[in-house]
């Protein structure tokens, strides 16, 4: 059976949208009006992993691109990157762990925890126009809460 996917956009809790910044980086900034068309549309795939009532494992691909968010060690630090994959083989139900995020739903907000690096989360900075990154702290200066907007296929 093919893996199930939904198209969506994400905004952080400060309402910053995510856009491409160069070929392999996302950044977060406030967008309005026609500029909203710049925001990245994700293909969120529902993949194999540890699931609970609040937690659903997903992979986050960029719609119609062979790029997925992945978590790897760089200089001994868990790091978020956009990784190119073979579109013939992705998405798939059993994604490699570096591509898997635990989508955690708390009070109508979403957190995306790395399955590879527990307690590390997709994060944005308070500042405008900064890279989206993998952060190891919740509840501090950096933002780890998001909302999801569904996009028709």
């Amino acid at each position: 059976a093919p893996v199930r996917s939904l198209n969506c956009t994400l905004r952080d809790s400060q309402q910053k949208s995510l856009v491409m910044s160069g070929p392999y980086e996302l950044k977060a900034l406030h967008l309005q009006g026609q500029d909203m068309e710049q925001q990245v549309v994700f293909s969120m795939s529902f993949v194999q992993g540890e699931e609970s009532n609040d937690k659903i494992p997903v992979a986050l691909g960029l719609k119609e691109k062979n790029l997925y968010l992945s978590c790897v060690l760089k200089d001994d630090k868990p790091t978020l990157q956009l990784e190119s994959v073979d579109p013939k083989n992705y998405p798939k139900k059993k994604m490699e762990k570096r591509f898997v995020f635990n989508k955690i739903e708390i009070n109508n907000k979403l957190e995306f925890e790395s399955a590879q690096f527990p307690n590390w989360y997709i994060s944005t900075s308070q500042a405008e126009n900064m890279p989206v990154f993998l952060g190891g702290t919740k509840g501090g200066q950096d933002i780890t809460d998001f909302t999801m907007q569904f996009v028709s296929s």
């Epitope: 969120m44 699931e51 659903i56």
Partner: nanobody, 123 residues
Framework: EVQLLESGGGLVQPGGSLRLSCAAS????????MGWVRQAPGKGLEWVSS????????YYADSVKGRFTISRDDSKNTLYLQMNSLRAEDTAVYYC????????????????WGQGTLVTVSS
């Protein structure tokens, strides 16, 4: 043509047990995650439980965890729901769903569902 035929519903007293079955045809059963959803009188659809293709992973709504057990027999193309310690609030029509995937805490999508079997828990 995909067909899902539920059976096993009925009237049971609080604390009692029932086993629901869902006979599937028209698709390669073993390839699909399957599940159960239910609709109580006057209420919306509620996700109950899911089981992965291969049957090695099972998922339950908090309201049924520890009381219901989902299982599958791929050789018989059949999905089961064993319901123990039934309560009045379990009264509902239970539907078998093909390719059932939960995408938010209480939201899910599926491709096909059956006609349902009624479970009534009452003394």
């Amino acid at each position: 043509e995909v067909q899902l035929l539920e059976s096993g519903g009925g009237l049971v007293q609080p604390g009692g047990s029932l086993r629901l079955s869902c006979a599937a045809s028209g698709f390669t059963f073993e390839d699909y995650q399957m599940g159960w959803v239910r609709q109580a009188p006057g209420k919306g659809l509620e996700w109950v439980s899911s089981i992965s293709a291969m049957g090695n992973r099972t998922y339950y709504a908090d309201s049924v965890k520890g009381r219901f057990t989902i299982s599958r027999d791929d050789s018989k193309n059949t999905l089961y729901l064993q319901m123990n310690s039934l309560r009045a609030e379990d009264t509902a029509v239970y539907y078998c769903a093909q390719n059932l995937v939960r995408y938010m805490k209480s939201q899910w999508m599926f491709d096909y569902w059956g006609q349902g079997t009624l479970v009534t828990v009452s003394s």
